[in-house]
């Protein structure tokens, strides 16, 4: 007996379409081996209408595909515009058409209800507007115009000229007449119901001369797009409703077990706890379409998802979706990285971010979330080098360790740093992930001094202070500029033996500038790492001012007092929207920290690591 | 609250039929999937036929056991299926119940892609 299954019998009606699920047993063979639907002929030949690796015969063309689903071991053969020469009997199966591992399906399509001659089809999702077109001879203009709705053997009037509408269509249709010579009236439904499926007649005039036109109106529920997304992923939902509702109230809900949807993000504000930092809808086009973004994907985000427009934000009958069936991928491509990371305050975090490995050139991004209405994500940094003005000195995106993940680092935390931050590129953007930064009690352990003065043509000497664990570790001193930290070159005064046995009084790297310069002015940055894994930073800023002469006075560059806690968003802030996440240059403009100068020389900055057992000693 | 009710069960000789049907009350909207297991005694639940609709077609699911034998029909409308049981044998005896989806994710011969069910109707075949 043959390990796939499916529907032994489909049935449908002409130009409606079928989704065909077929499932395998998902070994890792099953799973990346071809799959096919194929027709018998005949000559008991089994010919590939369209397979996973891309084929779709010419008959199928433009109205069928195939979708693998490894993970649930399914794939799915979708055929749209039916005709009654579909009939007949089908396989679907794995690997070639000609051996046993397949299933057959009979496909049955009908003819439909028989419509009286002449009836015009409309075929239209739940929600939508439908535009019922209703001719009419010359001599039938003054007259009464009318829809009917066909029940049984009876015709229930809907709308006329003379103002009368049927209580179940009120406030959602009207008849329209056009001017003279213009010999076709119209009637406009909106919010289509499931309910107003049916046959409809128009009738102009009465009596014997009376014109009738019959009208087939096909109510559909949308069927939901399978959208399969990686653990830890992320999802966008492009939700495009028409103009008709581009004013209302948006929203995205998922479908609970008793069939009702539980909103997960409305443009009114509201937003499901689950989805916290992880959710951004984003603002909406002319034509009302939006989109819904959703990173650190979670099985339990699996489920049927719906958009849709109604002024209360949330799911009403009658008002337009679009519908999707997520299912999350365990066997996700996207490495794990922690999703929460703590940092003290006045402290650091080091966090890694995955990226497609795929695309080590693209961009690379980190954003802030911010949860007020909507979501947002105004950027903070960006490989290119830019940082948002007030995390100047603190905040720097490396490509360590490259190969699919680089690393943002964010010092001198304060309680205002704990949040949701998302690490995103201007590539795939389902590699899009969210971590969460929290501030926990405790001391920073890396200690430098505060904001450092130094004089011109004078040798300046910066002590960090580290803690035993840290004595395997490498330490090293660098200048931060807005296009990241330039580690300063070490001096090499000894053994690297010299923190083997570690003193708790003074373990320490040291950074010389000697002679100070102007260009030394600017932030440096004090770290330990393991290869290209970056551990805890602490920073400095080191003010440069002429040697005193008598009446002079020092004034402390704004940068260096800059109130710990200052942290604004301006609204010139770039934002995550569809289209920049394509193309970043598309985000809006933005003042760009200028770059604080030249790299102090080689020869001039030097770096000591020194213990009380042994002065010098490696800057590992 | 949501119930089906299945009917038709009984007694019957060996290459008789049966009808068996299924109704769904306490829903405010249709069933995307309706389907029948059936249990022997001692035995596990195992997946009989399964009837699923969307749109405007229907999609029917049989196991290699019954195919040929049995046929499943029904109404998403009514939120009723029935179940037209043929040549019976000794191996159809069991209480078949009758399982209910609002969707039809899952594979349809796993209790799990199945949220309401019946309590159940025994059907025997004697020799």
């Known amino acids: 007996k043959s390990p796939v299954f499916g529907p032994q019998e489909v049935s449908s009606v002409e130009g409606n379409s079928v989704s065909i699920k077929c499932y395998y047993p998902p070994t890792s063979v099953n799973r990346h081996t071809r799959k096919y639907w194929c027709r018998k002929g005949a000559s008991g030949r089994c010919i590939t209408l369209v397979s996973s690796e891309g084929y779709v015969s010419s008959n199928y063309a433009g109205r069928a595909n195939l979708t693998n689903f490894p993970e649930n071991g399914t794939f799915v053969v979708n055929i749209a515009q039916l005709s009654r020469d579909d009939s007949g009997h089908y396989k679907c199966g794995l690997g070639i058409n000609s051996r046993g591992l397949s299933f057959d399906v009979s496909l049955e399509v009908s003819q439909g209800p028989e419509l009286p001659n002449g009836t015009e089809v409309y075929t239209v999702d739940v929600g939508r507007t439908v535009t019922i077109k209703c001719p009419f001879k010359t001599e039938n203009a003054p007259k009464t115009k009318a829809l009917y709705k066909k029940i049984g053997q009876t015709s229930v009037l809907v709308i006329d000229s003379r103002n009368y509408v049927n209580p179940n269509y009120k406030d959602r249709i009207r008849l329209r007449i056009p001017g003279t010579g213009q010999l076709i009236f119209t009637v406009v439904i909106d919010r289509l119901r499931l309910s107003d499926h049916g046959l409809y007649l128009c009738q102009a005039g009465d009596g014997s001369n009376r014109d009738e036109k019959n009208a087939d109106l096909q109510v559909l529920e949308p069927e939901p797009e399978l959208v399969y997304e990686d653990l830890r992923g992320s999802v966008t939902f492009h939700c495009a409703l028409g103009l008709e509702v581009a004013n209302v109230a948006k929203f995205l809900c998922r479908v609970n077990s008793r069939e009702t949807c539980d909103v997960v993000i409305n443009t009114l504000g509201k937003r499901d706890s689950a989805f916290e930092g992880r959710i951004l809808l984003n603002p909406q086009d002319k034509d009302g379409s939006f989109s819904v973004v959703i990173t650190g994907l979670r099985k339990e985000d699996e489920g049927r998802y719906l958009c849709g427009a109604h002024s209360d934000g949330q799911l009403q009958e009658g008002w337009p979706i679009q519908a999707w069936q997520l299912f999350v991928n365990e066997e996700s491509t996207i490495p794990r990285s922690p999703t929460v990371v703590k940092g003290v305050a006045g402290g650091s975090v080091a966090v890694l971010c995955p990226y497609n490995p795929k695309e080590s050139q693209s961009l690379k991004y980190w954003c802030l979330w911010e949860g007020a209405q909507n979501g947002r994500c105004p950027l903070l940094v960006e490989s290119q080098g830019l940082v948002q003005e007030q995390y100047e000195g603190r905040l720097s995106l490396l490509q360590e360790p490259g190969n699919g993940t680089f690393t943002v680092i964010l010092n001198q935390l304060t309680t205002q740093d704990a949040g949701f931050y998302w690490c995103l590129t201007n590539g795939d953007t389902r590699w899009r992930t969210t971590v969460e930064i929290k501030i926990i009690e405790g001391e920073p352990n890396l200690k430098v001094p505060g904001n450092v003065t130094a004089v011109l043509g004078e040798t300046l000497n910066i002590p960090c202070h580290f803690p035993c664990k840290f004595s395997s570790y490498e330490k090293y001193w660098c200048k931060w500029s807005n296009t990241g930290c330039q580690t300063l070159p070490s001096q090499d005064e000894g053994p690297s033996e010299a923190f083997v046995n570690c003193d708790e009084n003074s373990r320490l790297v040291s950074l010389t500038l000697n002679p100070v310069t102007r260009a030394d002015e600017g932030w440096y940055w004090c770290g330990v790492k393991q290869g290209h894994f970056y551990g805890e930073t602490a920073a400095v800023y080191v003010a440069v001012e002429e040697k005193k002469v008598a009446g002079s006075r020092y004034v402390s560059p704004a940068k260096a007092d800059a109130a710990p806690d200052e942290k604004v968003l301006d609204s010139g802030v770039r934002e995550i929207e569809n289209k920049a996440i394509q193309d970043p240059r598309l985000f809006a403009e933005e003042k760009v920290v200028a770059d604080t100068g030249d790299q102090a020389g080689g020869s001039r900055a030097s770096v000591d690591s020194s213990s009380s057992e042994e002065q010098g000693g490696s800057s590992k | 609250e949501v119930q089906l009710v299945e009917s038709g069960g009984g007694v019957v000789q060996a290459e008789d039929s049966l009808r068996l049907s299924c109704a769904a009350s306490g829903l405010s909207f249709s069933l995307s999937r309706m389907g029948w297991f059936r249990q022997a005694p001692g035995k596990e639940r195992e997946f009989v036929a399964t009837?699923?609709?969307?749109?405007?077609?229907?999609?029917?699911y049989y196991d290699d056991s019954v195919k040929g034998r049995f046929a499943v029909s029904g109404d998403n409308t009514k939120n009723t299926m029935n179940l037209q049981m043929k040549g019976l044998n000794l191996e159809d005896t069991g209480v078949y119940y009758c399982a209910a989806n609002p969707n039809n994710y899952g594979d349809p011969r796993t209790p799990g892609a199945y949220q309401y069910w019946g309590q159940g109707t025994q059907v025997t075949v004697s020799s």
């Open positions: 009837i699923e609709w969307s749109g405007r077609s229907t999609y029917k």
